[in-house]
Structure formats: structure tokens, C-alpha cells
């Protein structure tokens, strides 16, 4: 094949090599960019900056090599459009630093930075940690800081991410209240901070106030939906990012719902209870306290992480006619109480007939299959009941 006269020449099926001295000063308009998986750049003294726009359209890029060039600065978001990048070689350039944000979100198997005049500072604490933890092939490079010795020996006692303290009201919060949260940020070299409120949706009206080092957040006219929702304060400095999440407990009275008994490996009377704080529960059977046992007991389903409502069953493992009757669930918390009742019929009473009456003879085909002598339990018939929601 004839030698390629261009600044950048194809290499394999999806690679590009740019090695002609001084031919590039940016990576705009590379030929076939959208399909490139490998880009090799060498001897480009004029290529000094790598920014977000440079790698736009290189979504398939896996391997990027820029070596023996003039690279001085890589923007923190430079690789935003190359999420598949797994090998990054920036050796023998003019890099003094590289932000932790640059590699955040990438799954780099290899990061090569040897031969750069790195300047030891807290901004390289993340790289020092990679070296300590054996990540990305960094330890083998024995990275040096220009005129300061090995990166591994850089003092790091003062290199911490921001410290966050979120103040939440310690008094009870009721539906309709306004709540003020304050996030206090401490640390060196603070760059950015803010709130993450993605979980809040319609739980409150949100107003942000203030800035570093003290961020305010007012949640106005809160609803009970605010419970179990994370409100997150975040802050960043040159070392990294810190986040602290808090939840605001909004008090509201107990409520309860009961549903018709269903057979689920024995029987279940399904219920839902809600309230903040979580209500205490008590069952009544025909008006009397039902003492729970290993054969009649309350069983909760796994709770959803972001809601207060709890679903469960009153489990009746072997109910017979003696368990037929009226079941009431009482739920109470300091803000109110609620109850719901349901009639449940699990099995007909085999002894329920008048001795004076002729003994009924059933010709129902259901009975012909019953050979064990057990009472016939018609499992296809739904027990009658009513569903009541209170609260």
C-alpha cells in the first residue's frame, strides 16, 4: 500500500494514527471519528489542550494515546463523550496536573502518565491513591513530581475532600410545615457545592439560598411523601467530592387498610399500614385481642426504601372453622389511630348441623375426590369480606 501522506492515517479497521510532526493543534474533524475505537497521537507539539469539544463524536473510543506531544491541560470533562475509554496513555507531555474529575465515570484499566513534569499537590492525591491501591497500572510507572521526588512520598495529611454537616430540624415536622435545612461545608480549596433533590418530586416546594460555605434549602408546605426521601448536599474540591444525605421525618397519623383473605401457602389477610412514626399494630379476633403464635402471626413484606407504607399479612398457617370470624387491625401512633375490619371464612364448620335435621348428603362432584377424610376445603371459593380504609 502507498504511504499515507495525511496528518492522520487509518490503522486497522477502526484505528487512526497521527504521527506526522506538528500536524495537529486540536482533535477537531478527525476522519471517521464516530467509528474510531483507537486513536494514537505522537509528536504533536502544538496540541496543548484537550477539551470536551475535542472528543465529541468519539463515542466508541476505547484506547487513546497522546505521547511525546505538547499537552499541558486536560479539561475535567474532556472524556464526557467517551464513556467506553479503558486505556489512556498521556506519557511524555507537559502535564503538571490532572483533575480527579477527568477520570471519574471511566473504567480505566490503564492510565499512563510517566514522563510528565507533575507537580505534587493535593490535586494529585487521587493519583497517589491509585498508586497505593494498584489501580490502572500506575504503581509500575514510579511517577515522579518535578523536582519534588516520588509521587508516593507526597505528604497527604491535609489532602481531604470537603467535610459536610447538614442541620435538620430536631423538632417534629408536620404536614404543611416549612423546613429549613442548612449545609455547612468545610475544607480547603472548595470549588463547587449544591443540593441533589431528585427524589423530592411533589413532596415540597423547594427554595435554595446562600452559597459556599453555607448552603440553605427551604422545603415549603411539606407533604407526608417527603418521608424516606433523600435530600443530598454535595461539595467538591481539588481532592474529590463529598456527599451527605439526610431525610426529614414528617409526622402524620396512622392509617390502615385490610383486604380479603387469600390463600398463599396457607392463608394471608393482607394489610397496609402507614404513619410517621411507624404505628404499633394490634389484631383483634371477634373483638378480643389476638395473641400471635407461630401459626397465626404478622409478617411484613420487604419495605420499599423510599416510602413509609408497610404491607404485610396476618399469616394463618392452618386455619379451620374455629378461625372464621371478624379480624380487626388496630394501628396507632402519637398523631392518631385507625382500624379496619374484615370477615374471613376459611373452612365450613363440619359440626354445624342440628341433630334433629336429616344429615345432608352432598352429590357435589367436589366430594368424590376427597378420600382422606379431611373436611373438604373449597379452595376455589373466595372468602367473603369487605375492604375498609380508615385514616
Amino acid at each position: 500500500a502507498a504511504p499515507c501522506p495525511d496528518a492522520c492515517c487509518p490503522h486497522g479497521s477502526s484505528g487512526l494514527r497521527c504521527t506526522r510532526d506538528g500536524a495537529l493543534d486540536s482533535l477537531h474533524h478527525l476522519p471517521g471519528a464516530e467509528n474510531l475505537t483507537e486513536l494514537y497521537i505522537e509528536n504533536q507539539q502544538h496540541l496543548q489542550h484537550l477539551e470536551l469539544r475535542d472528543l465529541r463524536g468519539l463515542g466508541e473510543l476505547r484506547n487513546l494515546t497522546i505521547v511525546k506531544s505538547g499537552l499541558r491541560f486536560v479539561a475535567p470533562d474532556a472524556f464526557h463523550f467517551t464513556p467506553r475509554l479503558s486505556r489512556l496513555n498521556l506519557s511524555f507531555n507537559a502535564l503538571e496536573s490532572l483533575s480527579w474529575k477527568t477520570v471519574q465515570g471511566l473504567s480505566l484499566q490503564e492510565l499512563v502518565l510517566s514522563g510528565n513534569p507533575l507537580h505534587c499537590s493535593c490535586a494529585l492525591r487521587w493519583l497517589q491513591r491509585w498508586e497505593e491501591e494498584g489501580l490502572g497500572g500506575v504503581p509500575e510507572q514510579k511517577l515522579q513530581c518535578h523536582g519534588q521526588g516520588p509521587l508516593a512520598h507526597m505528604p497527604n495529611a491535609s489532602c481531604g475532600v470537603p467535610t459536610l454537616k447538614v442541620q435538620v430540624p430536631n423538632a417534629s415536622v408536620d404536614v404543611g410545615d416549612d423546613v429549613l435545612l442548612r449545609c455547612q461545608v468545610e475544607g480547603r480549596g472548595l470549588e463547587q457545592a449544591g443540593w441533589i433533590l431528585t427524589e423530592l418530586e411533589q413532596s415540597a416546594t423547594v427554595m435554595k439560598s446562600g452559597g459556599l460555605p453555607s448552603l440553605g434549602l427551604t422545603l415549603a408546605n411539606v407533604t407526608s411523601d417527603l418521608n424516606r426521601k433523600n435530600v443530598t448536599c454535595w461539595a467538591e474540591n481539588d481532592v474529590g467530592r463529598a456527599e451527605v444525605s439526610v431525610q426529614v421525618n414528617v409526622s402524620f397519623p396512622a392509617s390502615v387498610q385490610l383486604h380479603t383473605a387469600v390463600e398463599m401457602h396457607h392463608w394471608c389477610i393482607p394489610f397496609s399500614v402507614d404513619g410517621q412514626p411507624a404505628p404499633s399494630l394490634r389484631w383483634l379476633f371477634n373483638g378480643s385481642v389476638l395473641n400471635e403464635t407461630s401459626f397465626i402471626f404478622t409478617e411484613f413484606l420487604e419495605p420499599a426504601a423510599n416510602e413509609t407504607v408497610r404491607h404485610g399479612c396476618l399469616r394463618l398457617n392452618q386455619p379451620t372453622h374455629v378461625n372464621n370470624g371478624n379480624y380487626t387491625l388496630l394501628a396507632a401512633n402519637p398523631f392518631g389511630q385507625a382500624s379496619a375490619s374484615i370477615m374471613a371464612a376459611f373452612m365450613d364448620n363440619p359440626f354445624e348441623f342440628n341433630p334433629e335435621d336429616p344429615i345432608p348428603v352432598s352429590f357435589s362432584p367436589v366430594d368424590t375426590n376427597s378420600t382422606s377424610g379431611d373436611p373438604v376445603e373449597k379452595k376455589d371459593e373466595t372468602p367473603f369480606g369487605v375492604s375498609v380504609a380508615v385514616g
Epitope: H265, H266, N291, E292, T293, S294, F295, F297, T298, E299, F300, R315, N317, Q318, P319, T320, V322, M347, S372, D374
Partner: antibody, heavy 117, light 106 residues
């Protein structure tokens, strides 16, 4: 697989107490009731009580109500049965057994408690 | 308390025999459960909910009954079936067991 592993044999003096442990593995400890059953030499099975780790609910056989104490440690998935004021007739093998929707599905290997002066 | 009375207390039988053990409750129980125990071992759940065989229990075993009277039947006795069998009620506190039926080789 489900395992209930009980503590080793004990020899106790009359009037003293014994605490038998039952360590669970292979299932979600809090979802199952734990029963305690004893069997005197050459005799039948006698139910002592049951406990639900999920909420600490305990039911005792009236016969043991004042002497038996059932507890659980959820952090270690372990159930305990303590029997106080021991007498010679408490000499028996003590078993733990778990149940959820069906009775006593799995049993521990048993712990022999001998009460002798 | 619900008293459970098993009969017979002990039974000598030969391999291949059909054997029936009964359990009578002092008051009605919804279901009966049966356990097998061999010397020096913990009991094993054998039949539950009156007629369901526990995992690994051979089909020669069966259970039946209702109200106060329940039976465990072995259709054709095998050498490994010689053991003690206990019935148990799980319908009221305290849970109670029958006194046991010892099945031995004739």
C-alpha cells in the same frame, strides 16, 4: 443449606441455670419462629416455647413460663434458651427447631443437659 | 392443653407389613403433623398438614384424618422405617406431642 447448630453438652448442679444456644445459617433468621423442645431420657417430646426474632414475640408452655427465658441475637442469628432453678427432672436433650408456614421443618442436633449434684 | 394419645405405644412388625399408627386428640385440631426419630438423633419432620409428605419421605408413608382422629400408615414396612414416630398439633398453645410409637422389628 439450612443449619441449626446447638451449643455443647452441659452438666449443672440443682438450683443453677443453663443457657443453650442455637446458631442459624442458610436462611433469613428473622423470618422464622424458633421453637425449643426437650426430651428426657427414654421419654417423649415436650414443647418449651417459641420466639419470633422479627419482633421478639414469645409464647411459653405454661409449665415453663417462670423458669424458661427465650431470647435471640439477630446480629449473630442465634437463639437462646435459658432454664433456671434446675432440678434433676430437667435432665434432657434440648432441641431448637424452626418454623414459618409449616411446623418444625428443621431441627438442631440437640444439647444434652445433665442436672446432678 | 390439647392432649395427644398415640396407639399403640410400641409395635413389633416385620418387613413388608402394613402398619397403622393412630393419634387421638382431646379436642378437635385442624391438622396433624408427624415426626420420625431414630435413637440418638433429632426428630425429623415426616408428615405435615395431616397428609403431606416431607421432602425425601418415601411414598409408602401416608397420613389421614380430621377433627380428633388421625393416622399414619406405612403400606409396606422397610428396614429403615424402624424408629419412633410422634404426632404433634400446631393449632393451640402449648404445642403438644403424642407420647410416641416405637416401631421395632419382630
Amino acid at each position: 443449606q439450612v443449619q441449626l447448630v446447638q451449643s455443647g453438652a452441659e452438666v449443672k448442679k440443682p438450683g443453677s441455670s443453663v443457657k443453650v444456644s442455637c446458631k442459624s445459617s442458610g436462611y433469613t433468621f428473622t423470618n422464622y419462629w424458633m421453637h425449643w423442645v426437650r426430651q428426657a431420657p427414654g421419654q417423649g417430646l415436650e414443647w418449651i416455647g417459641e420466639i419470633y426474632p422479627n419482633n421478639g414475640r414469645v409464647n411459653y408452655n405454661e409449665k415453663f413460663k417462670n423458669r424458661a427465658t427465650l431470647t435471640v441475637d439477630i446480629s449473630t442469628s442465634t437463639a437462646y434458651m435459658e432454664l433456671s432453678s434446675l432440678r434433676s427432672e430437667d435432665t434432657a436433650v434440648y432441641y431448637c427447631a424452626r418454623s414459618r408456614y409449616d411446623p418444625m421443618e428443621d431441627w438442631g442436633q440437640g444439647t444434652t443437659v445433665t442436672v446432678s449434684s | 392443653d390439647v392432649q395427644l394419645t398415640q396407639s399403640p405405644s410400641s409395635l413389633s412388625a416385620s418387613v413388608g407389613d402394613r402398619v397403622t399408627i393412630t393419634c387421638s386428640a382431646s379436642s378437635s385440631v385442624g391438622y396433624m403433623h408427624w415426626y420420625q426419630q431414630k435413637p440418638g438423633k433429632a426428630p425429623k419432620r415426616w408428615i405435615y398438614d395431616t397428609s403431606k409428605l416431607a421432602s425425601g419421605v418415601p411414598s409408602r408413608f401416608s397420613g389421614s384424618g380430621s377433627g380428633t382422629d388421625y393416622t399414619l400408615t406405612i403400606s409396606s414396612l422397610q428396614p429403615e422405617d424402624f424408629a419412633t414416630y410422634f404426632c404433634q398439633q400446631w393449632s393451640s398453645i402449648p404445642l403438644t406431642f403424642g407420647q410416641g410409637t416405637r416401631l421395632e422389628i419382630k
